[in-house]
C-alpha cells in the first residue's frame, strides 16, 4: 500500500554538545516493523542510521555517525520513529531525509538541523 | 486500549489557583506528546498547552502563558496543568489528549480524556 | 497566529445525504490538518489526520482532501450517528487553532 512520510515541517534547533531527537512518520499509519527505515545526508546520501530486517544495520554507517545515533522504535508498530543523535557537531547542521522502504515502494520527507553554540552570546547594551 | 482519566476540577475564585492531573494507561507514555485542550460551556475547542514526550520542551497559548505550566512524571504515567490566576475566562471543560507522535510533525490528537470541568467564580 | 475558519456554522441534512465541510487557514499549512468529530456531552473523536488519512476505525465514509488552505471534509453517505460537531485542526505550526466548529443537524 501507498503512505507519505512526514517530518518536521520546521528546522530543529539543537545546540554542540547536546542530543537531538528527529521524528519521521507514515501517512496513513501503518507497522512498518518489516520495512526499511532509513536517515541520511544530501548531497551525497551518507548513511546516518539505517534499519533493516528488523534491527539497526550499524556496519552501513558514515563513520562520523558511529556510536551518536539510536532509533527510538517504541510506536514503529503505528509508522512512527524517531532518530536520536548524541553529541551534537556544528557538522551536523543541514538538510537530513528520512524513508521508509516497502518492497519497493519508497517515499520520504527532507528536514533540516541548525546546530547554534551554547556558549555564544551577545553582551547587552 | 488507551485511557486518559483527568482529575483535579473543580470550583475557583478569581486569582486562585488548581493543579488537573491526567492519568494515562494503554500506551508508552513517554514515547507520545501530550496536551490540554479546553471548552468554555457552549463554545469551541481551544487549546492550551503541548509537552513533549521527554518533557524537555512546552508550548502555551498566549491566553494561558505566564499563568499556565504544564509538566509531566513519566514514572508515573501523568500529565499535569498548573493553573495560577485564574480568570473567569478560563471556565471551560479541560480535556487531557494524547497526541498522535511528537510536538513537531503529530501534535493532533487520537485519544481524549473524559474532561473535568474547571469553574471560575466568585 | 493561523486563523481557521470553517463554514458553514451549521447545516441541516438528512440520513443518506453527502455532506462537505469546508476548513480555511489564514496562511499555508501544508497537509497538516485534522478533522474531529464531538458529539454533546463527550470528549471529541479524531477522524481525518493530515489532511487526508482516515483514522483507524473511523467509517470510509468520511474522507478528506485539500492542501495549503482549502480542507474539505466529506461525508458521502450521512448515517444518524454522524449528527454532532465537527471540528478542524492546524498542526503546521504554535499556536495550535481549531476552526469554530460546524454543527450538522437533522433536517
Known amino acids: 500500500g501507498q503512505f507519505r512520510v512526514i517530518g518536521p515541517r520546521h528546522p530543529i534547533r539543537a545546540l554542540v554538545g547536546d542530543e537531538v531527537e528527529l521524528p519521521c512518520r507514515i501517512s496513513p499509519g501503518k507497522n512498518a516493523t518489516g520495512m526499511e527505515v532509513g536517515w541520511y545526508r544530501p548531497p551525497f546520501s551518507r548513511v546516518v542510521h539505517l534499519y533493516r530486517n528488523g534491527k539497526d544495520q550499524d556496519g552501513d554507517q558514515a563513520p562520523e555517525y558511529r556510536g551518536r545515533t539510536e532509533l527510538l522504535k517504541d510506536a514503529i508498530g503505528e509508522g512512527k520513529v524517531t532518530l536520536r543523535i548524541r553529541n551534537v557537531r556544528f557538522s551536523d547542521e543541514g538538510g537530513f531525509t528520512c524513508f521508509f522502504r516497502d518492497h519497493s515502494y519508497q517515499e520520504e520527507a527532507a528536514m533540516e538541523l541548525k546546530v547554534e553554540d551554547p556558549f555564544y552570546w551577545v553582551s547587552p547594551g | 486500549q488507551v485511557q486518559l482519566v483527568e482529575s483535579g476540577g473543580g470550583l475557583v475564585q478569581p486569582g486562585g489557583s488548581l493543579r488537573l492531573s491526567c492519568a494515562a494507561s494503554g500506551f508508552t507514555f513517554s514515547s507520545y506528546a501530550m496536551s490540554w485542550v479546553r471548552q468554555a460551556p457552549g463554545k469551541g475547542l481551544e487549546w492550551v498547552s503541548v509537552?513533549?514526550?521527554?518533557?524537555?520542551?512546552?508550548y502555551y497559548a498566549d491566553s494561558v502563558k505566564g499563568r499556565f505550566t504544564i509538566s509531566r512524571d513519566n514514572s508515573k504515567n501523568t500529565l499535569y496543568l498548573q493553573m495560577n490566576s485564574l480568570r473567569a475566562e478560563d471556565t471551560a471543560v479541560y480535556y487531557c489528549?494524547?497526541?498522535?507522535?511528537?510536538?513537531?510533525?503529530?501534535?493532533?490528537?487520537?485519544?481524549w480524556g473524559q474532561g473535568t470541568l474547571v469553574t471560575v467564580s466568585s | 497566529d493561523i486563523v481557521m475558519t470553517q463554514s458553514p456554522s451549521s447545516l441541516s441534512a438528512s440520513v443518506g445525504d453527502r455532506v462537505t465541510i469546508t476548513c480555511r487557514a489564514s496562511?499555508?499549512?501544508?497537509?497538516?490538518l485534522a478533522w474531529y468529530q464531538q458529539k454533546p456531552g463527550k470528549a471529541p473523536k479524531l477522524l481525518i489526520y493530515d489532511a487526508s488519512s482516515l483514522e483507524s476505525g473511523v467509517p470510509s465514509r468520511f474522507s478528506g482532501s485539500g492542501s495549503g488552505t482549502d480542507f474539505t471534509l466529506t461525508i458521502s453517505s450521512l448515517q444518524p450517528e454522524d449528527f454532532a460537531t465537527y471540528y478542524c485542526q492546524q498542526f503546521n505550526s504554535y499556536p495550535l487553532t481549531f476552526g469554530g466548529g460546524t454543527k450538522v443537524e437533522i433536517k
Open positions: 509537552i513533549s514526550g521527554s518533557g524537555g520542551s512546552t
Open positions: 496562511q499555508g499549512i501544508s497537509s497538516a
Open positions: 489528549a494524547k497526541a498522535y507522535y511528537d510536538i513537531l510533525t503529530g501534535s493532533l490528537f487520537d485519544s
